[in-house]
C-alpha cells in the first residue's frame, strides 16, 4: 500500500473507560495532529477508517461494525461503544485517506472494571476547592455528546460508597455538586452516575473525581513563602555539611 503519515501510538491519550458503559472516542487526528477538522476532510473526499490491535496481540484487524444492537459504531469522527466489554481493550487506529493522501494515529484504550463502591484502576482527575470560601461547584465531567438535550437523564452523586442525599454542606443539583462551604472533611472521591434512555435501553455513565480541599489564596500564598524558605534552608544546610 502507498505511504501513510504514521503518527505512531499516541500514549498521551491513555483512554480509560468503564466496562459495560457507553464510550465515545474521537479520532485524535483532528484534535492533535491535523490542522483541519473532520467536516473539511469529509467534504474533500477523505474517508476515515478504524481498526484495532487486541491486547497482547500484534495483528491489526478491522473493527466489527456488524455486532448485535450496533454495539460498536462510527459516527463522523467518533467511535462509539454501546456499551464496552472488557475485551475491547487494545490499541485503536484511525486512518484518514483517499487515493493521494493518508494519515493515521493509534491510541490505547483500556476497559476497566469497577466495584460496587466505584473503586477501580481508573486515573482520577483532581478538583481543588478552597476551604470555607463560599459556594463552589463541581460538574459531572465528560458526559457531553452521549445524549441529546431533549433527553433528561437522572444523576446520582456519591461520596465514596454513599449516596449524597441530605441537606448538609454538599448538595447534588443535577449535573452539579454544590459545596455550600468546603470543609477538610469534604476531601475524598466523588462519583456521579448519569442514567439515560436510548432506543429502549438504559445506559449508565460513571465519572469519579477526587476533591482536594486546600487553603484559600491568601493562606496558599503564605504556604508558598514558607515552602520556599524551607527549601532555601534545606539547601543552605546541605551545602554546609
Amino acid at each position: 500500500s502507498e505511504r501513510c503519515d504514521d503518527w505512531g501510538l499516541d500514549t498521551m491519550r491513555q483512554i480509560q473507560v468503564f466496562e459495560d458503559e457507553p464510550a465515545r472516542i474521537k479520532c485524535p487526528l483532528f484534535e492533535h495532529f491535523l490542522k483541519f477538522n473532520y467536516s473539511t476532510a469529509h467534504s474533500a473526499g477523505l474517508t476515515l477508517i478504524w481498526y484495532w490491535t487486541r491486547q497482547d496481540r500484534d495483528l491489526e484487524e478491522p473493527i466489527n461494525f456488524r455486532l448485535p444492537e450496533n454495539r460498536i459504531s462510527k459516527e463522523k469522527d467518533v467511535l462509539w461503544f454501546r456499551p464496552t466489554l472488557l475485551n475491547d481493550t487494545g490499541n485503536y487506529t484511525c486512518m484518514l485517506r483517499n487515493t493521494t493522501y493518508c494519515s493515521k494515529v493509534a491510541f490505547p484504550l483500556e476497559v476497566v472494571q469497577k466495584d460496587s463502591c466505584f473503586n477501580s484502576p481508573m486515573k482520577l482527575p483532581v478538583h481543588k476547592l478552597y476551604i470555607e470560601y463560599g459556594i463552589q461547584r463541581i460538574t459531572c465531567p465528560n458526559v457531553d455528546g452521549y445524549f441529546p438535550s431533549s433527553v433528561k437523564p437522572t444523576i446520582t452523586w456519591y461520596m465514596g460508597c454513599y449516596k449524597i442525599q441530605n441537606f448538609n454542606n454538599v448538595i447534588p443539583e443535577g449535573m452539579n455538586l454544590s459545596f455550600l462551604i468546603a470543609l477538610i472533611s469534604n476531601n475524598g472521591n466523588y462519583t456521579c452516575v448519569v442514567t439515560y434512555p436510548e432506543n429502549g435501553r438504559t445506559f449508565h455513565l460513571t465519572r469519579t473525581l477526587t476533591v482536594k480541599v486546600v487553603g484559600s489564596d491568601i493562606s496558599r500564598g503564605l504556604n508558598d513563602i514558607f515552602e520556599a524558605q524551607k527549601i532555601e534552608w534545606h539547601e543552605h544546610h546541605h551545602h554546609h555539611h
Epitope: G134, I135, Q165, F167, I171, E173, G174, N176, S178
Partner: antibody, heavy 118, light 112 residues
C-alpha cells in the same frame, strides 16, 4: 410542560393541623427538590423548608422546626406539607416550588390559601 | 424583618431603566449566588435571574442581574406597564443548617 398542582383552600381553627398537597408532572419527580414557601396577606415570601423527593430527606427553617413535616409519595409524584398547632399568624398562601438550592426556584405551584380563624 | 434588605418601592416611566438593590452580608449574598423573582398581582412568583446574572429561557434580556460584595442589583431596561409587580431577591445561608432567605420585596410602579 412542568406543572405543580396544589390542593384547595383550607379554613382551620387555632391549634389544628393542615396538610397541603402538591402534585408534580412534566418532569422526573426525583430529579429536583421541592421547597415550601408561604406568603401572609400583603407580606413578603417566607421559606419554610425543602424536601428531596429521591430519598425523602428534609431541611426545615428554624422557625418551623417541630411544627412542620414534609413528606412525599413517589408513586403519585406528590409532596405534602403538614403544619401543626396552627395560629392566626399562619394565615397565608402556601406555595410548593420546584428547584435546587443554589440556582433558584424555577417552577411554582398556584398556591393554597390557608385561613386560621376561630 | 428580612435578612436581605430591599427598598420597599421604586417607580419609573415606561421606556426608562430602573434598578432594585438587595443588601445582605458575607454569610449570605457575600459568599453565595443570588436569584430574583417577579410576582405579578395575584399570581405565584416567577424566576427572573439565577446565579447572580443568568436568565432562564423565556426571560427577556431587558432583565439583568449583578452582584458586588454583599449587595446584588436587578436591572430592568425599557420599562413596560406589565413589569409593574413585586420583586424579590433570594439567596441562602449555611451555618450547619441550610436556610433559604428572601428579601422583603420591592413594589415596582410604572408611572403613567
Amino acid at each position: 410542560q412542568v406543572q405543580l398542582v396544589q390542593s384547595g383552600a383550607e379554613v382551620k381553627k387555632p391549634g389544628a393541623s393542615v396538610k397541603v398537597s402538591c402534585k408534580a408532572s412534566g418532569y422526573t419527580f426525583t430529579s429536583y427538590y421541592m421547597h415550601w414557601v408561604r406568603q401572609a396577606p400583603g407580606q413578603g415570601l417566607e421559606w419554610m423548608g425543602i424536601i428531596n423527593p429521591s430519598g425523602g430527606s428534609t431541611s426545615y427553617a428554624q422557625k418551623f422546626q417541630g411544627r412542620v413535616t414534609m413528606t412525599r409519595d413517589t408513586s403519585t409524584s406528590t409532596v405534602y406539607m403538614e403544619l401543626s398547632s396552627l395560629r392566626s399568624e399562619d394565615t397565608a398562601v402556601y406555595y410548593c416550588a420546584r428547584g435546587f438550592v443554589t440556582s433558584g426556584i424555577d417552577y411554582w405551584g398556584q398556591g393554597t390559601l390557608v385561613t386560621v380563624s376561630s | 424583618q428580612s435578612v436581605l434588605t430591599q427598598p420597599p418601592s421604586v417607580s419609573a416611566a415606561p421606556g426608562q431603566k430602573v434598578t432594585i438593590s438587595c443588601s445582605g452580608s458575607s454569610s449570605n449574598i457575600g459568599n453565595n449566588y443570588v436569584s430574583w423573582y417577579q410576582q405579578l398581582p395575584g399570581t405565584a412568583p416567577k424566576l427572573l435571574i439565577y446565579d447572580n446574572n443568568k436568565r432562564p429561557s423565556g426571560i427577556p434580556d431587558r432583565f439583568s442581574g449583578s452582584k458586588s460584595g454583599t449587595s446584588a442589583t436587578l436591572g430592568i431596561t425599557g420599562l413596560q406597564t406589565e413589569d409593574e409587580a413585586d420583586y424579590y431577591c433570594q439567596t441562602w445561608t449555611y451555618t450547619g443548617r441550610l436556610w433559604i432567605v428572601f428579601g422583603g420585596g420591592t413594589k415596582l410602579t410604572v408611572l403613567g
